[in-house]
Amino acid sequence: IWELKKDVYVVELDWYPDAPGEMVVLTCDTPEEDGITWTLDQSSEVLGSGKTLTIQVKEFGDAGQYTCHKGGEVLSHSLLLLHKKEDGIWSTDILKDQKEPKNKTFLRCEAKNYSGRFTCWWLTTISTDLTFSVKSSRGSSDPQGVTCGAATLSAERVRGDNKEYEYSVECQEDSACPAAEESLPIEVMVDAVHKLKYENYTSSFFIRDIIKPDPPKNLQLKPLKNSRQVEVSWEYPDTWSTPHSYFSLTFCVQVQGKSKREKKDRVFTDKTSATVICRKNASISVRAQDRYYSSSWSEWASVPCS
Amino acid sequence: RNLPVATPDPGMFPCLHHSQNLLRAVSNMLQKARQTLEFYPCTSEEIDHEDITKDKTSTVEACLPLELTKNESCLNSRETSFITNGSCLASRKTSFMMALCLSSIYEDLKMYQVEFKTMNAKLLMDPKRQIFLDQNMLAVIDELMQALNFNSETVPQKSSLEEPDFYKTKIKLCILLHAFRIRAVTIDRVMSYLNAS
């Protein structure tokens, strides 16, 4: 058993049929010595008396808020949560496996630039009685500070019969140099509590590996005289690291119709303009990627050919 | 430690071309190592990230873009800093700043070159003959060093009398290649920045 936060404790249980469970001793936080009784949750049934209460925790029915009273007055609470371990593996029931970029990916993180700011998100089908708390650091043995905000519900989607909820959190490394060469990864830890179930999820990454620039901005078209060719120009996204001559981007320019199966014109360039062939009912799209370290491409910025 | 005196090419920038070739070569070599050594811990997640130039050169700091010199977090680890106060860069000769930066890059390349050559000598003794360093990568390191045009004492190649542990050597190769790729990215950024300046 360990303390998650004040008056909240996590009991780690090997979860299999007829498991013996864990013996837990609760102590009432009071100077009083006698006349103390214990109850669980909303029940008025007295579970025991005395300053301490010893219980055998085997299942979720044994978890919950234990309260010690004296003469109708509440003295203190202890909330017991369960953390299940099945076949030596901690349970991952609360969050959905996003399977990208590999299986068992519960947390996904992205950074728009090298400033040390990043966003992580996760998915769940659970809608109520759900809380998250996020901690982060650079390295684990001698951790350096990363400050994370509160996790918030950022999107809701319908997937078949199920509703899916996306939560996200923003974090900022306390003293980040955009030009630094990372040797220690960022560690992100998410504590998830659903009703009386506790789970924790972690992710470890270098900022350089989670870079995904915003799409290029200010796309403009200039038809070339006596030609089907069009000069398309754009600018670096505002959120990208500066100076741009140091943090350079490379671009992919594509002309395509509405369907992905349609024919297309595609060209890669390090410049902020390109000449392509425009077709009726097609659109020109441009996306960006770090020129020197190939992490993710940005989403497309698009303008219609016409 | 006295850094060698630079005679940077005024047009800078055959260096840009060579640095692009360097990044390409080390990225290809790393990819080849990952594929060939698939049963060794050779991915970014599996290896320890070591920097053989740590405390010996200060390329990131010495080559910091002017725009980032106002960022306290970028300055706190400077050892061979040419900046003595927050805004005095303008008062120093840009050529001095560039010389310091380029000499630091040269020193990096020299150190990696020695490590890679020593390692290749060991790998050539491996009866499995599983992996060797790409001669193109070694040639590209050499070309960039020549383009940087520095004079500095040659570092003797390390020779080792004990029987090489090929498993450890291959793990070390992965560690070196990962670190060198990151440094090659920095070098490419620096060359691009200097070229634009």
Epitope: T250, K263, K264, D265, V267, I277, R279 | -
Partner: antibody
Framework: QVQLVQSGAEVKKPGSSVKVSCKAS????????LHWSRQAPGQGLEWMGW????????EYAPKFQGRVTITADESTSTAYMELSSLRSEDTAVYYC???????????WGQGTLVTVSS | DIVMTQSPLSLPVTPGEPASISCRAS??????LHWYQQKPGQQPRLLIA???QSISGVPSRFSGSGSGTDFTLTISSLQPEDFATYYC?????????FGQGTKVEIK
């Protein structure tokens, strides 16, 4: 299976024209760009131009501008390349080729040898 | 027009050995570079698109690298069926242009 079948070999006199055909099968004809390239005996490849069969748009290499005409007939899934004012140095194997990507080629025809000789 | 220069023009290789062909552009073309293989009396065959993207059906021993002006096609271990002429082609701008070809022959 996408296939491009070209017309047979031709022998032409200098100053005349030649029209080579290229019939496509497999896939929708207008879903692809069609290119024409040529290869002189023992020489490398030379790109001549492309056509978008959907709208008839064409682009020619400056070297052939004014001498080459590429057309397409959607009803028969056939593309044509006509080269006029032939000279001996136009002796080559002419290839039609196609791709959904405009700027490179993933399927080539078998080639048509055009010999220009007096 | 962008001029593509291949080297060497002839490359004698022992079967089972690796081979590398270089292609240089007269100006920077990013990764707009494609590789083809052509055997005598046959039409060309696409091997690699956009400098390094593998094409389905092409053996994994063929790989491409490079960007800007310098590109390389590598065959990790030459098989008897790989003896052919190889062409690079730029698609950075029209007109599309090819290298003059590299003939890989048996040593």
């Amino acid at each position: 299976q996408v296939q491009l079948v070209q017309s047979g070999a031709e022998v032409k006199k200098p100053g005349s024209s030649v029209k080579v055909s290229c019939k496509a099968s497999g896939g929708t004809f207008s879903d692809y760009y069609l290119h024409w390239s040529r290869q002189a005996p023992g020489q490398g490849l030379e790109w001549m131009g492309w056509i978008d069969p959907e709208n008839g748009d064409t682009e020619y290499a400056p070297k052939f501008q004014g001498r080459v005409t590429i057309t397409a007939d959607e009803s028969t899934s056939t593309a044509y390349m006509e080269l006029s004012s032939l000279r001996s140095e136009d002796t080559a194997v002419y290839y039609c080729a196609r791709n959904k990507e405009l700027r490179y080629i993933d399927v080539w025809g078998q080639g048509t040898l055009v010999t220009v000789s007096s | 027009d962008i001029v593509m220069t291949q080297s060497p023009l002839s490359l004698p290789v022992t079967p089972g050995e690796p081979a590398s062909i270089s292609c240089r552009a007269s100006q920077s073309i990013s990764i707009n570079l494609h590789w083809y293989q052509q055997k005598p009396g046959q039409q060309p065959r696409l091997l690699i698109a956009f400098a390094s993207q593998s094409i389905s059906g092409v053996p994994s021993r063929f790989s491409g690298s490079g960007s800007g002006t310098d590109f390389t096609l590598t065959i990790s271990s030459l098989q008897p069926e790989d003896f052919a002429t190889y062409y690079c082609q730029q698609s950075n701008s029209f007109p599309l242009t090819f290298g003059q070809g590299t003939k890989v022959e048996i040593k």
